[in-house]
């Protein structure tokens, strides 16, 4: 029978599919930075090249005895999870091992850097097919390790890293916190976060998705035919590295941005019980478990979007938070969220030639998050249309006046703190389709984009009664690009996108006697790409 | 995903310029020193000296050599363990923490990061 972890990540209808080239080989190469490995194990024999790379610290303790099977345990198991004959994900994939962890599973940032540089040098000396680098290790936050990952990713290498086993925010660890790395948390057979003794999987906004990481059967270094189960975010990352290898084998032209977006789009959503995570991390942690996406031939051409959260701004009055998309992605909208509700809104601005999403804290606020909606859309061209704050008078609509440009998102901010002003409606599709509507004292920013066949519409859902949140989802075939809260009588905490659902959060005043005009509304901008059609705004 | 983690960044007090070797680096240090926030994971004595992105390969080697020369003047032994160039310009150096202030004044230095442990997950 198929082990639970493989059944979970490769849907039954895909399990018969041939994921290597006609001769059974794979053009994708996976580099594993880990302990030494037992290359003679039946699971991985003939698939693994042990490079001469070795950069490890001395083992601690005078009484430490190097036992080959113990030294090889972690790396051998992971090599088996990636490409093992029976228990592996990408069964035909060739793997290169670099030793950066000693017999106690310890390494150094510097050793890892030298390992990453070794891979880059190998790539320059002998260019090959797509490369995947698996980093089943974690240390404290390291700017230089993150930078090295970023630079390697820019050369076309896909890096997959363990989120870490510290039951903590993955952003505090490296390489997990590197934005260019695909960071993987661990779930068990019940799709719940993995507990490891008193600790467990890391979580938070630096995690891209989760994958099986508990009691994973794989190659054991005890003997060449032995198997054992191991647990951790390393195992989870190995599953995703295997999935990525399969995706690249089918379609070697896939970029890192496309791979990440497709992993997110086709993951299993909302199966993880978020109560396991600290309360303040639940909104930031993705509720998705990896599965092998279908090939691009079956699903190509669609608009792919993901949500990127900023770091918390901190509580100072002028604090800001900035969320950035990957270089290939387009920022289609920007929103903000504050647990206290004290925020001065959000806006898109250019920093160093890149559009970023910025959220502004307000006096007395505990801090804000910026929430960017980052999308992949061929030949897209976006611009921001701003209306400065009106000192008095009616609301000022901002629309996309350029030909064939459609509204993909609305942002707004106040130069001065005005909580009452925030309770005024912002975006209305009725009567004024395709425009952002501001009000006095708010600056309004419309995100207007042009791409072949891009069409968008606003979808709203309002709740008149007491509620902490209102949601609205884009229907099948449409992708959420923008999300706003249109407040009723309550103070809005902000809005953010969770996959294809727009979530408007409010601090409920508890009044049950509201009129429908006072209803809190979640307003989603839903778009789709139909390459044959012209860009258009769809009137609901 | 993250810009700066829970991370220690320190501006170090700099030694005075007292001999001709140091006069070459008479600019004020804007470089910072960084180290792991978890003390038990730190590896003091080994540092990655990270240079500005546009630094040329020859300048990397010259900077490492200059640091060695300056340090030797003061009686400090430095071991340049590795020179980085393919992913970022910089070098890995084994040296006394006493020399950090001096190293931060070197031309082209963006920041210096103390080495730290990573662990199998």
């Amino acid at each position: 029978s198929i082990p639970w972890n493989l059944e979970r990540i490769i849907p039954a209808w895909q399990q018969t599919e041939e994921d290597s080239s006609p001769d059974g080989s794979s053009q994708v190469e996976v580099y594993l930075l880990d302990t030494s490995i037992q290359s003679g194990h039946r699971e991985i024999e003939g698939r693994v090249t042990i490079t001469d790379f070795n950069s490890v610290p001395e083992e601690d303790g005078t009484r430490f005895h190097r036992q080959a099977s113990k030294c090889d345990s972690h790396g051998t198991h992971l090599a088996g999870v990636v490409s093992g004959r029976d228990a592996g994900v990408a069964k035909g994939t060739s793997l290169h091992s670099l030793r950066v962890l000693n017999c106690q599973g310890k390494g150094t940032v510097s050793g890892t850097l030298i390992g990453l540089e070794f891979i880059r040098k190998s790539q320059l000396i002998q260019p090959s097919g797509p490369l995947v680098v698996l980093l089943p290790l974690a240390g404290g936050y390291s700017r230089i390790l993150n930078t090295a990952c970023q630079r390697l990713a820019r050369t076309g290498v896909v890096l997959v890293a363990a989120a870490g086993n510290f039951r903590d925010d993955a952003c505090l660890y490296s390489p997990a916190s590197a934005p260019e790395v695909i960071t993987v948390g661990a779930t068990n057979a019940q799709d719940q976060p993995v507990t490891l003794g008193t600790l467990g999987t890391n979580f938070g906004r630096c995690v891209d998705l989760f994958a099986p990481g508990k009691d994973i059967i794989g190659a054991s270094s005890d003997c060449s035919t032995c198997y054992m189960s191991q647990s951790g975010t390393s195992q989870a990352a190995a599953h995703v590295a295997g999935i990525v290898a399969m995706m690249l084998n089918r379609d070697p032209a896939l970029t890192l941005a496309e791979l990440r977006q497709r992993l997110i789009l086709f993951s299993t959503k909302d199966v993880i019980n978020m109560a396991w995570f600290p309360e303040d991390q639940r909104v930031l942690t993705p509720n998705r478990v990896a599965t092998l996406p279908p090939s691009t031939q079956e699903t190509g051409g669609q608009l792919l979007c993901r949500t990127v959260w900023s770091a918390h701004s901190g509580p100072t009055r002028t604090a800001t938070a900035t969320a950035r998309c990957a270089p290939e992605e387009e920022l289609l909208s920007c929103s903000s969220f504050s647990r206290s509700g004290r925020r001065r809104g959000d806006r898109i601005e250019a920093i160093g030639g890149q559009q970023v999403c910025k959220a502004l804290n307000a006096f007395g606020g505990e801090g804000v998050y910026a929430v960017a909606r980052c999308c992949l859309l061929p030949r897209v061209n976006c611009s921001i249309h701003n209306t400065p704050a009106a000192r008095a008078g009616p609301q000022t609509p901002v629309h996309c006046h350029q030909k064939d440009h459609v509204l993909t998102g609305c942002s707004f901010h106040w130069e001065v703190e005005n909580l009452r002003a925030q309770q005024q409606p912002l975006l209305r599709s009725r009567h004024q389709p395709g425009q952002c509507v501001g009000h006095q004292e708010a600056s309004v920013h419309a995100s207007c984009c042009h791409a072949p066949g891009l069409e968008c519409k606003i979808k709203e859902h309002g709740i008149a009664g007491p509620a902490e949140q209102v949601t609205v989802a884009c229907e099948a075939g449409w992708t959420l690009t923008g999300c706003n809260v249109l407040p009723g009588a309550s103070l809005p905490l902000g809005a953010y996108s969770v996959d294809n659902v727009c979530v408007a959060r409010i601090r409920d005043a508890g009044r049950a006697d509201r009129t429908s005009e006072e209803a809190t509304v979640a307003a989603a901008i839903c778009c789709r790409s139909r390459p044959s059609a012209k860009a258009s705004w769809v009137h609901q | 995903q993250d810009e700066d983690g829970d991370y220690e960044e320190l501006m170090l007090a700099l030694p005075s310029q007292e001999d001709s070797l140091v006069d070459e680096a008479s600019h004020v240090a804007t470089a910072t020193f960084r180290r792991c926030s978890k003390e038990a994971w730190r590896l003091p004595g080994t540092y990655v000296v990270v240079l500005m992105e546009e630094t040329q390969r020859l300048q990397v080697e010259q900077t490492a050599h200059r640091l060695q020369t300056w340090a030797a003047r003061r009686g400090y032994v430095i071991k340049v363990l590795h020179v980085f160039y393919d992913l970022f310009p910089g070098f890995l150096v084994k040296m006394s923490s006493d020399l950090l202030g001096l190293a931060l004044k070197l031309p082209h230095v963006e920041y210096i990061e103390e080495d730290s442990l990573v662990f199998a997950q």
Epitope: - | P15, Q68, A72, R73, G75, Y76, V77, D98
Partner: antibody
Framework: QVQLVESGGGLVQPGGSLRLSCAAS????????MHWVRQAPGKGLEWVSN????????YYADSVKGRFTISRDNSKNTLYLQMNSLRAEDTAVYYC???????WGQGTLVTVSS | DIVLTQSPATLSLSPGERATLSCRAS???????LAWYQQKPGQAPRLLIY???SRATGVPARFSGSGSGTDFTLTISSLEPEDFAVYYC?????????FGQGTKVEIK
């Protein structure tokens, strides 16, 4: 100009103690490693000990380990060598030297004899 | 420990002659930390050469150093009367710091 002046030498009985000082001037003392080197009468140079600029790192020759202690007071620009359990073979001229041994003091004679 | 062996123990030469002093290490020495000193009776040693080949401030050009790995040489191209003294090589790249036993350059 750089100057190093040793003091504290003298005659001491075996098993006794002595504390040598080296007063430094003309340079930023705390930037430099400092060393003690000795020379027995008619013999060659023997390195004894050194200390880093901050005082955080010290090294000793095996022949003096556990008996001698090097220290420094950067506020006073002074280097010290505390010598305990002295032996006849410790008889020598003791020099302090700066950094890369580019400047030396004139030396102070320590005689261990009963 | 790195043992430095100097040869010859004594070198008897006349002023104007060329002196070649050798220093051999028991294991490879980082040449950045190889130095030569001159010592005259009743005086402290004086640094002549650092980094195996760089002349210290104020040292005449007739003194030169060369070598790498385990073999190093101090050359005095033309001996002056004030050059007759004891010369020591030293390595300070590894602890313990070690000196050679010295070469005495005397007037023939």
């Amino acid at each position: 100009q750089v100057q190093l002046v040793e003091s504290g030498g003298g005659l001491v009985q075996p098993g006794g103690s002595l504390r040598l000082s080296c007063a430094a001037s003309g340079f930023t003392f705390s930037d430099y490693y400092m060393h003690w080197v000795r020379q027995a009468p008619g013999k060659g140079l023997e390195w004894v000990s050194n200390i880093s600029g901050s005082g955080s790192t010290t090294y000793y020759a095996d022949s003096v380990k556990g008996r001698f202690t090097i220290s420094r007071d950067n506020s006073k620009n002074t280097l010290y060598l505390q010598m305990n359990s002295l032996r006849a073979e410790d008889t020598a001229v003791y020099y302090c030297a700066r950094g890369m041994f580019d400047f030396w003091g004139q030396g102070t004679l320590v005689t261990v004899s009963s | 420990d790195i043992v430095l062996t100097q040869s010859p123990a004594t070198l008897s030469l006349s002023p104007g002659e060329r002196a070649t002093l050798s220093c051999r290490a028991s294991q490879s020495v980082n040449s950045n930390y190889l130095a030569w000193y001159q010592q005259k009776p009743g005086q402290a040693p004086r640094l002549l050469i650092y980094g195996a080949s760089s002349r210290a401030t104020g040292v005449p050009a007739r003194f030169s150093g060369s070598g790498s790995g385990t073999d190093f040489t101090l050359t005095i191209s033309s001996l002056e009367p004030e050059d007759f003294a004891v010369y020591y090589c030293q390595q300070w790249g590894d602890v313990p710091i070690t000196f050679g036993q010295g070469t005495k350059v005397e007037i023939k």
